[in-house]
């Protein structure tokens, strides 16, 4: 029986929630206030996340698991895990090391994070500006020029979805 | 914030035995392992054992286990390291440390010393 | 008892070198490694455990790698305040045990 035993690890036994405890002889001891193990067989718990300042906590940390945090109104998640809170600007504005800045000419951002996108450019695709770009939206390209011929209609249904990038056949 | 304060250098003959106290404060007196580590002038850190002060769980270094005791006396969070049949290859500074939670099985936080001299 | 070797015993640096220091287990530990700083007529003092996770309020220029038998100790850039003897531990197997020291020096 002994040599059967000393050939399985002792810790293989320990459920999550509990640790194979060093101290006690390998014995399977729960895990201690604020400490997690969410796997069986562990030597030791981990110690709770804690979601403190700009984080606020999404789920509380049990013994088999960790806590999650998320973002206080005002910020948004960055990074695996909301490991980072960034401030939320507003529609047309981008993070800055300055700080909140409108975005540039030329430029827009449709959400509360990320950074200003160049408004697209309908003649690349031969297409005409239908609708003028702001700093919180894009451009909407309408037809090309050349479906814009006299005596056509400036108001036909639009074309059915293409892939981006397709230019009209 | 955690202190450990051990009590004050001890002159002792061979053969004699020595009791070094660790007064704690600062956390959960009964939530946290107690370790003793011990230095030889010159030399290295060498653990002894340590005591789980909530129900007095105790584990020795084999190389001690004949002549250490270890106590606590939970009214005035202090602990205690008794060595017996002292020699002079036991002349070194001994420490008490508490075992971080939830145990990495490093110990944090350490008292000052207690020099223990051991001289005919 | 698992031994534990470090190397070298002692080395002399300058202030804003690269520090490394080594330490051996004779068996796996895992993860269960950690590392403490000694000043002349102090208590040591926990810089890193479980291999790589730094004590509070340990300056982020300290740092650990290393799994199984094999663990790196690293000073990025090396401060005059860091003049100490450094040991590492195991905490995976009772009785815990230390390496022999490496006693670091400044050139």
């Known amino acids: 029986f002994e040599r059967t035993r000393s050939l399985q690890d002792p810790c293989s036994n320990c459920p999550a929630g509990t640790f194979c405890d060093n101290n006690r002889n390998q014995i399977c001891s729960p895990c201690p206030p604020n400490s997690f193990s969410s796997a069986g067989g562990q030597r030791t718990c981990d110690i709770c996340r804690q979601c403190k300042g700009v984080f606020r906590t999404r789920k509380e940390c049990s013994s088999t698991s960790n806590a999650e945090c998320d973002c206080t109104p005002g910020f948004h998640c960055l990074g695996a895990g909301c490991s980072m809170c960034e401030q939320d600007c507003k529609q047309g504005q981008e993070l800055t090391k300055k700080g909140c800045k409108d975005c540039c000419f030329g430029t827009f951002n449709d959400q509360k994070r990320g950074i200003c996108r160049p408004w697209t450019n309908c003649s690349l695709d031969g297409k005409s500006v239908l609708v003028n770009g702001t700093k919180e939206r894009d451009v909407v390209c309408g037809p090309s020029p050349a479906d814009l011929s006299p005596g056509a209609s400036s108001v036909t249904p639009p074309a059915p979805a293409r892939e981006p990038g397709h230019s009209p056949q | 914030q955690v202190q450990l304060v051990q009590s004050g250098a001890e002159v002792k003959k061979p053969g004699a035995s020595v009791k070094v106290s660790c007064k704690a404060s600062?956390?959960?007196?009964?939530?946290?392992?107690i370790n003793w580590v011990r230095q030889a002038p010159g030399q290295g850190l060498e653990w002894m054992g340590n005591?789980?002060?909530?129900?007095?769980?105790?584990n020795y270094n084999q190389k001690f286990k004949d002549r250490v005791t270890m106590t606590r006396d939970t009214s005035t969070s202090t602990v205690y390291m008794e060595l017996s049949s002292l020699r002079s290859e036991d002349t070194a500074v001994y420490y008490c440390?508490?075992?971080?939670?939830?145990?990495?099985?490093?110990?944090?936080?350490w008292g000052q010393g207690t020099l223990v001299t051991v001289s005919s | 008892d698992i031994q534990m070797t470090q190397s070298p015993s002692s080395l002399s640096a300058s202030v804003g070198d690269r520090v490394t220091i080594t330490c051996r287990a004779s068996q796996d530990i895992s993860n269960y490694l950690n590392w403490y700083q000694q000043k002349p007529g102090k208590a040591p003092k926990l810089l890193i455990y479980?291999?790589?996770r730094l004590h509070s309020g340990v300056p982020s220029r300290f740092s650990g790698s290393g799994s199984g038998t094999d663990f790196t100790f690293t000073i990025s850039s090396l401060q005059p305040e860091d003049i100490a003897t450094y040991y590492c531990?195991?905490?995976?197997?009772?009785?815990?045990?230390f390496g022999p020291g490496t006693k670091l020096e400044i050139k």
């Open positions: 479980y291999t790589s």
């Open positions: 531990q195991q905490g995976h197997t009772l009785p815990y045990t």
């Open positions: 440390a508490r075992m971080g939670d939830p145990f990495y099985y490093a110990v944090d936080y």
């Open positions: 600062g956390y959960t007196f009964t939530s946290y392992w």
């Open positions: 005591i789980y002060p909530s129900d007095t769980y105790t």
